[in-house]
């Protein structure tokens, strides 16, 4: 009786089990009783990444510079090209089909994690004792100046957006 299921790396066709084509190759003709499956390597700029019975290879992804993309890893006959974004930009999705500028952390927020080609800037609010007075994609929250170490006193309290203002100690208080 003909098989109803085939072994791993085989497929069922015309009542018999044929070998799948290995990654990097496409199907030219199914096996017959007398001839094995015929496969051909994918062409330049093409790939297939699984054991398959595809009659066409997939085109490598194009990293379009107009969309801010560049090649991170060149594709092979078995792998697709991996795109990443130019400096200052990051991918809009996991498949990285386009790029957008990294966001800046507004005053009162600092950079927790600097953006990469595939992830955006992560900002965090400046906690008590820290501030950020700039809009930046790189600057972390900075600590308030320590007036005491400068033999000065706080004249104006700091906020999450401003540093403390130090001034000379009041001599008459001594």
């Amino acid at each position: 009786e003909p098989p109803t299921a085939c072994r791993e790396k085989q497929y069922l066709i015309n009542s018999q089990c044929c070998s799948l084509c290995q990654p990097g190759q496409k199907l030219v003709s199914d096996c017959t009783e007398f001839t094995e499956t015929e496969c051909l390597p994918c062409g330049e700029s093409e790939f297939l990444d699984t054991w398959n019975r595809e009659t066409r290879c997939h085109q490598h992804k194009y990293c379009d510079p107009n969309l801010g993309l560049r090649v991170q890893q060149k594709g092979t006959s078995e792998t697709d090209t991996i795109c990443t974004c130019e400096e200052g930009l990051h991918c809009t999705s996991e498949s990285c089909e386009s790029c957008v500028p990294h966001r800046s952390c507004l005053p009162g927020f600092g950079v927790k994690q600097i953006a990469t080609g595939v992830s955006d800037t992560i900002c965090e609010p400046c906690p008590v004792g820290f501030f950020s007075n700039v809009s930046s994609a790189f600057e972390k929250c900075r600590p308030w100046t320590s007036c005491e170490t400068k033999d000065l006193v706080v004249q104006q309290a700091g906020t999450n957006k401003t540093d403390v203002v130090c001034g000379p100690q009041d001599r008459q208080r001594a």
Partner: antibody, heavy 125, light 116 residues
Framework: QVQLVESGGGVVQPGRSLRLSCAAS????????MHWVRQPPGKGLEWVAV????????YYGDSVKGRFTISRDNSKNTLYLQMNSLRVEDTAVYYC??????????????????WGQGTTVTVSS | QAVPTQPSSLSASPGASASLTCTLR?????????IYWYQQKPGSPPQFLLR?????????GSGVPSRFSGSKDASANAGLLLISGLQSEDEADYYC?????????FGGGTKLTVLG
């Protein structure tokens, strides 16, 4: 291209032995079942024997059972037929033929697609 | 071994069609049988034409024209080799073959004569 070349035929007396060989080229010999088929002068085709691609099974036609042995050497891409206790009625052209491939499910090594040119065996006193 | 039965000879005119039969004995069901067909011309080894089990399970020999096709006649328990548009070079002996009880069995062969 796929080729099968038989050798070892000749004239032999009844009761004697003969060994036929078949050299295969142009395909993966170790993936295919292989047969011997014979054709007596002026008559039709008669199947002699088949051997599975890996030598794990052999089957014989009734008229040669117990006298003929089919074997193969996959490292040499060669099929053999050892013929013992030859009879006058074994006189024929002996063809080596290619059977189905190992990717077929069990029992599908028995079809034949490629044939050699044949070697003539004459058993005569 | 049960030899499939083939008529010993058949004649037909060029351009006509020919239907060669391979009748199996009762007890061997043609419906589930794989039937192989071979053509042999004088002084040459047989050549594989086709294998036919059903319309969804058939195999044409390499380089064999589509004028050669397989079929079955369930009521007659027979396999058929159909040759359309007969040509003079189709004149040959035709053998059917089956696998039965762990043995390959050939029919007795049909000699096809193309008239004229």
């Amino acid at each position: 291209q796929v080729q099968l070349v038989e050798s070892g035929g000749g004239v032999v007396q009844p009761g004697r032995s003969l060994r036929l060989s078949c050299a295969a080229s142009g395909f993966t010999f170790s993936s295919h079942g292989m047969h011997w088929v014979r054709q007596p002068p002026g008559k039709g085709l008669e199947w002699v024997a088949v051997i599975w691609y890996d030598g794990s099974n052999e089957y014989y036609g009734d008229s040669v059972k117990g006298r003929f042995t089919i074997s193969r050497d996959n490292s040499k891409n060669t099929l053999y037929l050892q013929m013992n206790s030859l009879r006058v009625e074994d006189t024929a052209v002996y063809y080596c033929t290619r059977g189905g491939g190992h990717w077929n499910y069990e029992g599908h090594y028995y079809g034949m697609d490629v044939w050699g040119q044949g070697t003539t065996v004459t058993v005569s006193s | 071994q049960a030899v499939p039965t083939q008529p010993s000879s058949l004649s037909a005119s060029p351009g006509a069609s020919a239907s060669l039969t391979c009748t199996l004995r009762s007890g061997i069901n043609v419906g589930s049988s794989r039937i192989y067909w071979y053509q042999q011309k004088p002084g040459s080894p047989p050549q594989f034409l086709l294998r036919y089990t059903s319309d969804s399970d058939k195999l044409q020999g390499s380089g064999v024209p589509s004028r050669f096709s397989g079929s079955k006649d369930a009521s007659a328990n027979a396999g058929l080799l159909l040759i359309s548009g007969l040509q003079s070079e189709d004149e040959a002996d035709y053998y059917c073959m089956i696998w039965h009880s762990s043995a390959v069995v050939f029919g007795g062969g049909t000699k096809l004569t193309v008239l004229g």
